[in-house]
């Protein structure tokens, strides 16, 4: 799987899941953000060969076609595809509010 | 410019109703809470709630009652304010109003035109 | 809910004389070394325009004319050289607890 546990530990230049780490005040402005600071958002990137991680059917297609046409533009995009949620805590006021926000954090990647 | 344009005046009959938009430009819309606030002819002003528009996060005024849901359209960079069940006392005009950035609660500094809402059978 | 109670309701001030206008707060507004209080003005038919920031911070772009001060419950607001556009109701507003509240207005007129 092109996972953290598997692109975290390769020098790995096909499609996979790249650490990026998001600082709330520093990055995006939002000083409200209490805690976490900032996290580990994670990105996809890198080419996406014949087979690898093919999501459908359509993008096992593409990828055979980008092999034997490379000079074609159409190829398979390397996209997320296991999120995980964050939880932040920040204040209304002196109240303090917990939220947990759905797919902030890529785990995978695949090519799509 | 940072601007914050609202639509225009509605006449609304008591028990419906009214959803009143704010536009914004000339700044990042999802990286500032917004706020929504009334004003009573001749009254003062009342906080009715908020909404940080990269997730939808919403905090209300429970003097509303659950009447007022805020909502933001990040592709349009536009926020509305719905307001259900109206009476003869939400006779007011509604501004939006972007809040400071320091904190989720905060001043606010920049405002809509204000939208003005009669309800009258 | 915090309640400010703004005083006078009005005041009528002759040009370049100095108005004071005052704000206080049922519970203390300060937190972490800052008083959430702010100020605002509304002209006549216009919205409302943020004046003062976290008690004593002067917006940007506002005359160097307006001044806060105070911490805990008691605030005041001070105009000096008073000018014709000046007129208007004056709010305060605190954030220390929700909900965010405003006190009652201040109308200030030139006599």
């Known amino acids: 799987a092109l996972d953290t546990n598997y692109c975290f530990r390769n020098l790995e230049e096909n499609c996979c899941v790249r650490p990026l780490y998001i600082d709330f005040r520093q990055d995006l402005g939002w000083k409200w953000v209490h805690e976490p600071k900032g996290y580990y958002a994670n990105f996809c990137s890198g080419p996406c060969p014949y087979l690898r991680s093919a999501d459908t059917t359509h993008s096992t297609v593409l990828g055979l076609y980008n092999t034997l046409n490379p000079e074609a533009s159409a190829s398979p995009c390397c996209v997320p595809q296991d999120l995980e949620p964050l939880t932040i805590l920040y204040y209304v006021g002196r109240t303090p509010k917990v939220e947990q926000l759905s797919n902030m954090v890529v785990k995978s990647c695949k090519c799509s | 410019e940072v601007q914050l344009v609202q639509s225009g005046a509605e006449v609304k009959k008591p028990g419906a109703s009214v959803k009143v938009s704010c536009k914004t430009s000339g700044y990042t819309f999802m990286k500032y809470w917004m706020n929504w606030v009334r004003q009573a002819p001749g009254a003062g002003l009342d906080w009715m709630g908020q909404i940080f528009p990269a997730w939808g996060s919403t905090n209300y005024n429970e003097m509303f009652e659950g009447r007022v849901t805020l909502t933001a359209d990040t592709s349009t960079s536009t926020a509305y304010m719905e307001l259900s069940s109206l009476r003869a006392g939400d006779i007011a005009v509604y501004y939006c109003?972007?809040?400071?950035?320091?904190?989720?609660?905060?001043?606010?500094?920049?405002w809509g035109q204000g939208t003005l809402v009669t309800v009258s059978s | 809910d915090i309640v400010m109670t703004q005083t006078p309701p009005s005041l009528s001030v002759s040009p370049r004389e100095t108005a004071s206008i005052s704000c206080r707060a049922s519970e203390s507004v300060d937190s972490y070394g800052n008083s959430f209080m702010h100020w605002y003005l509304q002209k006549p038919g216009q919205s409302p325009q943020l004046l003062i920031y976290l008690a004593s911070n002067l917006e940007s772009g506002v005359s160097d004319r307006f001044s806060g001060s105070g911490s805990g419950t008691d605030f005041t607001l001070r105009i000096s050289r008073v000018e014709a556009n000046d007129t208007g109701v004056y709010y305060c507003?605190?954030?220390?607890?929700?909900?965010?509240?405003f006190g009652q207005g201040t109308k200030l007129e030139l006599k």
């Open positions: 507003q605190q954030n220390n607890e929700d909900p965010l509240t």
């Open positions: 109003a972007r809040g400071y950035g320091n904190y989720a609660l905060d001043a606010m500094d920049y």
